[in-house]
């Protein structure tokens, strides 16, 4: 059974992940120059189901494509450091989902733009955090 300390640690990690995802989304949305619309041509894959920490496997598998899109953004004077940011997210995701059980991600038929993708995982984090508090 999870202890209060492990629950607290999970909550803090989720909050960190949430902040990172929100920072990327805000960076896209707040960047007034619509030159970044080219990022919207990239396709992201969404989980068929995302209700448990193990479903973060689906996010982990999309981190490399996310980094590639952010690299394009950076070349257009978008001030995020994609490699560092994605590396941080990857570490948190690996800790949260655990490596004890191998989970095969199932993807939904519908794909998403980077904005839709980030919003989906932000909602996931918020949902899990709310069950822990």
């Amino acid at each position: 059974a999870p202890t209060s300390s492990s629950t607290k640690k999970t909550q803090l990690q989720l909050e960190h992940l949430l902040l990172d995802l929100q920072m990327i989304l805000n960076g896209i949305n707040n960047y007034k120059n619509p030159k970044l619309t080219r990022m919207l041509t990239f396709k992201f894959y969404m989980p068929k189901k995302a209700t448990e920490l193990k479903h973060l496997q689906c996010l982990e598998e999309e981190l490399k494509p996310l980094e590639e899109v952010l690299n394009l953004a950076q070349s257009k004077n978008f001030h995020l450091r994609p490699r560092d940011l994605i590396s941080n997210i990857n570490v948190i995701v690996l800790e949260l989902k655990g490596s004890e059980t191998t989970f095969m991600c199932e993807y939904a038929d519908e794909t998403a733009t980077i904005v839709e993708f980030l919003n989906r995982w932000i909602t996931f984090c918020q949902s899990i955090i709310s069950t822990l508090t």
Partner: antibody, heavy 122, light 108 residues
């Protein structure tokens, strides 16, 4: 009404220079990328390059890099495509088109000009 | 350079279903767009984001995607649908826009 209006047909001789135009109206011209597309007689569409009129940032297709120059004058909402020395093989229809977008979606080339016919012949 | 491959021609009888395919290595990661071009006219967007229809485009036009192939489907084809159809996407870096070679749809 959102529209792109292109300059009229041109007949030129090989070696001459040419600049054709594409004027946008009905939207914020500086906030949307404008692309140029070539269509040679009886052939398909070829993407030449694109410009962001807000700051004139430009990307060329590798096939057209160094062959043409894409520019824009945001004060008069107009994008340009120019040649310094025309060749017979430049004979084609040239279209300008706007890259449309929304808050979280990219609409592709959603508005097109009517096209400018360029004929290069001695 | 990156290429999108389309069949040169597709023929179909009125009322039947026409399917036009477009294949490219980057299509699993880049959205596709479809344009209709009738003789003497500028191209017109008929599908964006693989499967979305702009306002004013009839419901018989639909798009789908599977792996490295996207498909434009025209259900209950009408004589007025006879035209050239082009798919368009971007290379894997998102830097360059690319068109397919075009497909001539003939309504028999």
């Amino acid at each position: 009404e959102v529209q792109l209006v292109q300059s009229g047909a041109e007949v030129k001789k090989p070696g001459e220079s040419l600049k054709i135009s594409c004027k946008g109206s009905g939207y914020s011209f500086t906030s949307y990328w404008i692309g140029w597309v070539r269509q040679m007689p009886g052939k398909g569409l070829e993407w030449m390059g694109i410009i962001y009129p807000g700051d004139s940032d430009t990307t060329y297709s590798p096939s057209f890099q160094g062959q043409v120059t894409i520019s824009a004058d945001k004060s008069i909402n107009t994008a340009y495509l120019q040649w310094s020395s025309l060749k017979a093989s430049d004979t084609a229809m040239y279209y300008c088109a706007r890259e449309g977008f929304g808050e979280s979606i990219h609409y592709g080339l959603d508005v097109w000009g009517q096209g400018t016919t360029v004929t290069v012949s001695s | 350079s990156y290429e999108l491959t389309q069949p040169p021609s597709v023929s179909v009888s009125p009322g039947q279903t026409a399917r036009i395919t477009c294949s490219g290595d980057a299509l699993p990661r880049q959205y596709a767009y479809w344009y209709q071009q009738k003789p003497g006219q500028a191209p017109m967007l008929v599908i964006y984001k693989d499967s979305e229809r702009p306002s004013g485009i009839p419901e018989r036009f639909s798009g789908s995607s599977s792996g490295t192939t996207v498909t434009l489907t025209i259900s209950g084809v009408q004589a007025e649908d006879e035209a050239d159809y082009y798919c368009q996407s971007a290379d894997s870096s998102g830097t360059y826009v690319v068109f397919g070679g075009g497909t001539k749809l003939t309504v028999l």
